[in-house]
């Protein structure tokens, strides 16, 4: 069944980073429009991106209501015009998305080194705690506030003059590492959720090196 002259959406794919979540699909519409619905397993369907000619729909506002829920979306195809003028055959075509659990599946965005401070042979490296679109009591939560101790950061650091990397880990957003006095070091960090089975790691942050703007040095 389905409405004549429409084709069902396919390749429904969730694209999500730090909970910014977009559903994408194909094909580009020809003489049809789309409407997306999203629901939790126990909830009602809610329509989004009504009669859109886009092939993506931002569902962030819905999934941030409870990032630990599992969501399902479906994409309806409607003829590009009222049904009586285009011909109708009952229920519209639709295609279901894969299930999506934001807390377990959203990609971790590329982290940023906020600052580093050297005091003698110690360096304190701070990772920026990025704000997400998840809200609690009207305020946006940071990545750390959402994930708590499930989120760790791995620091890669090395002397500017060599390629041998060392690593350190933290379940806060700060590292305190030992360095050789008089040596310049470079740093990169990666966000990791060890308990995950998919999307466990972010890409590495941009490299920051001592002797550049972000650093502060004290004897």
């Amino acid at each position: 069944s389905g409405t004549t002259n429409t084709v069902a959406a396919y390749n429904l794919t969730w694209k999500s980073t730090n909970f910014k979540t977009i559903l994408e699909w194909e094909p580009k519409p020809v003489n049809q429009v789309y409407t997306v619905q999203i629901s939790t397993k126990s909830g009602d369907w809610k329509s989004k991106c009504f009669y859109t000619t886009d092939t993506e729909c931002d569902l962030t506002d819905e999934i941030v209501k409870d990032v630990k829920q599992t969501y399902l979306a479906r994409v309806f195809s409607y003829p590009a015009g009222n049904v009586e003028s285009t011909g109708s055959a009952g229920e519209p075509l639709y295609e279901n998305s894969p299930e999506f659990t934001p807390y377990l599946e959203t990609n971790l965005g590329q982290p940023t080194i906020q600052s580093f401070e050297q005091v003698g042979t110690k360096v304190n490296v701070t990772v920026e705690d990025e704000r997400t679109l998840v809200r609690k009591n009207g305020t946006f939560l940071t990545l750390r506030q959402v994930f708590g101790k499930d989120l760790i950061y791995t620091l890669y650091y090395w002397k500017s003059s060599s390629s041998g990397k060392k690593t350190a880990k933290t379940n806060t957003n700060e590292f305190l590492i030992d360095v050789d006095k008089g040596e310049n070091y470079c740093f990169s960090v990666q966000a990791v959720i060890p308990s995950r089975t998919v999307n466990r790691k972010s890409t590495d942050s941009p490299v920051e090196c001592m002797g550049q703007e972000k650093g502060e040095f004290r004897e």
């Epitope: 519409p29 409407t35 009669y51 000619t53 309806f76 015009g81 049904v83 009586e84 009952g90 229920e91």
Partner: antibody, heavy 119, light 113 residues
Framework: QVQLVESGGGVVQPGRSLRLSCAAS????????MHWVRQAPGKGLEWVAV????????YYADSVEGRFTISRDNSKNTLYLQMNSLRAEDTAVYYC????????????WGQGTLVTVSS | DIVMTQSPDSLAVSLGERATINCKSS????????????LAWYQQKPGQPPKLLIY???TRESGVPDRFSGSGSGTDFTLTISSLQAEDVAVYYC?????????FGGGTKVEIK
Amino acid sequence: QVQLVESGGGVVQPGRSLRLSCAASGFTFRSYGMHWVRQAPGKGLEWVAVITYDGINKYYADSVEGRFTISRDNSKNTLYLQMNSLRAEDTAVYYCARDGVYYGVYDYWGQGTLVTVSS
Amino acid sequence: DIVMTQSPDSLAVSLGERATINCKSSQSVLFSSNNKNYLAWYQQKPGQPPKLLIYWASTRESGVPDRFSGSGSGTDFTLTISSLQAEDVAVYYCQQFHSYPLTFGGGTKVEIK
């Protein structure tokens, strides 16, 4: 000929509920998307809600989301608007309107029903 | 949301003269795939519901006199009444149907000078 006749308007206190109906005739109701549009006294037009021809998909203006529910009974050729938690700013003439050549182009409108929210 | 801005708010024109109403959208309502502008114009007389005049920015609804014409593309649109008649006294609204929520302009009141 196409006819849309709204009913159910009246005076209601803030916080109370009201259900509007729109009886359709003269066309194949089940084949058309339907909308509610309102007009506050002396003001312009404001789109309120839409429901697809099949009744599956519904969409609302932010100003009424969570308070109003649009529905339809294709066997009775009737469109509904359930209005809960009414506010003074919901005072308006409520029109039902039919999708025309394209979604959101209204080729037929009802005469409207006045809803007054006042204590 | 797409914001629709009409100008002027009111317009007084002599019978038989031309009336021009402008409508500006905060973002383009042109869909490049079919090169159509998702814009409509309505006429509302006192105590009556609106009546569809123009859709796709320039297509006249059947039964609408040819003195009414629509033009424009993208974000800037115009409704023209080439020779104002007494029965044209009304408020005119533009509306975008490009994306939801659907939005209307604030209206332009046309009167006889």
